[in-house]
């Protein structure tokens, strides 16, 4: 079955880091990019960045540059998104989404991971 | 960054009626070389991830009912639901992928 399964909800303290995983199954990950998109409560979707799953090249949105790191482990068919220096405004649902080379849209999403930042 | 502006913010439509959602981008999303507009539409229901409906402004994703259609080019785009069904109640987002990615603010569609 073609799917993306994300790690479970996290509660973090301000200043800490969080690492969310996204495991792919049912397709060859090297043919795709994995994007990370977040959605704060009641807010619009916000693009964070992506990784080319074949060669690990990454591009990040300027807003997150220096605070987000997207990696991948091809042997585990898994992509990761780590966000550091967490603040309360980072409380959101974080999604991974698949984008096939040269098409520029998300045809498959993970179920989402709620990250709560609270002291 | 390219700014995506959706209107209206919310829309109440009777079952079987037409729903029209607009999306305006701050710059053209048309790549003249490929002839494609890099705009997609997604549907999101509470507690679920978004679901792809339309890509390249007007191409329907497989499995999406034909009551959903996309149109427009350049900076002005429209998502139309020709005959609203109960299961279409959701928030709809446009998204540009011409330069990186940005989403519109969403349009909530509910039943009148």
């Amino acid at each position: 079955q073609v799917q993306l399964v994300q790690s479970g909800a996290e509660v973090k303290k301000p200043g800490a880091s969080v690492k969310v995983s996204c495991k792919a199954s049912g397709f060859n990950i090297k043919d795709y990019y994995m994007h990370w998109v977040r959605q704060a409560p009641g807010q619009r979707l916000e693009w964070m960045g992506w990784i080319d799953l074949e060669n690990a090249n990454t591009i990040y949105d300027a807003k997150f540059q220096g605070r987000v790191t997207i990696t991948r482990d091809t042997s585990a068919s898994t992509a990761y998104m780590e966000l550091s220096s967490l603040r309360s405004e980072d409380t959101a649902v974080y999604y991974c989404a698949r984008d096939v080379y040269g098409r520029y849209f998300y045809d498959l999403w993970g179920q989402g991971t709620l990250v709560t930042v609270s002291s | 960054d390219i700014v995506m502006t959706q209107s209206p913010d919310s829309l109440a439509v009777s079952l079987g009626e037409r729903a029209t959602i607009n999306c305006k981008s701050s710059q053209s999303l048309l790549n003249a070389r490929t002839g494609k507009n890099y705009l997609a539409w997604y549907q999101q229901k509470p507690g679920q991830p978004p679901k792809l409906l339309i890509y390249w402004a007007s191409t329907r994703e497989s499995g999406v009912p034909d009551r959903f259609s996309g149109s427009g080019s350049g900076t002005d785009f429209t998502l139309t639901i020709s005959s609203l069904q109960a299961e279409d109640v959701a928030v709809y987002y446009c998204k540009q992928s011409y330069s990186r990615r940005t989403f519109g603010g969403g349009t909530k569609v509910e039943i009148k």
């Epitope: 992506w50 040269g102 520029y104 | 790549n31 070389r33 890099y38 011409y98 330069s99």
Partner: antibody
Framework: QVQLVQSGAEVKKPGSSVKVSCKAS????????ISWVRQAPGQGLEWMGG????????NYAQKFQGRVTITADESTSTAYMELSSLRSEDTAVYYC????????????????????WGQGTLVTVSS | EIVMTQSPGTLSLSPGERATLSCRAS???????LAWYQQKPGQAPRLLIY???SRATGIPDRFSGSGSGTDFTLTISRLEPEDFAVYYC????????FGGGTKVEIK
Amino acid sequence: QVQLVQSGAEVKKPGSSVKVSCKASGGTFSSYAISWVRQAPGQGLEWMGGIIPIFGTANYAQKFQGRVTITADESTSTAYMELSSLRSEDTAVYYCARGAPNYYGSGGYDDGWFDPWGQGTLVTVSS
Amino acid sequence: EIVMTQSPGTLSLSPGERATLSCRASQSVSSSYLAWYQQKPGQAPRLLIYGASSRATGIPDRFSGSGSGTDFTLTISRLEPEDFAVYYCQQFGRYPTFGGGTKVEIK
């Protein structure tokens, strides 16, 4: 209409480097891609790598990784291809062309096919 | 890397005849990412077809492209004297590769 004009022929010694330029006119140079393709005498075409100037970083074919450097100067609308550690098998006509693989995940920045092409630059490697 | 194999290596035909050139990919290629080029001696290649079947600007309609998956075809419906040249197919995905070329010569 985009036009690409390349620098002139070069004769180089084995072990040295060569830098070929490709000046573009027409269109918005920063947002379109430039590839470099070579053709040895009587042989086929071989993609070496490409760059989208607005992003700055280049991508290379595995065969040339570590030996080729592709750069772009937006101020002069010029792309460059430098090949180092030259050997006799590098004797070829080197072409620049508009278009390159879009590694940058953004639909607005060109798309793959190569058109137009520069006129070609013959690089001869001989001792 | 995707290997593109063209056949035949050489095609000997008379003006007015139909030319059919084949290109096979070692793995499936999106039709969006398949192009054909024409090259004459001492000249740079010239784009004929992109997206497997879309004619480039200024290309006569006697040139047509078709195919999908791993098998693609360039057809010249009626050869003109200026069509005798070498033709290359190319896939332009992540790592572009060209076929070895088909030489179309006068019989």
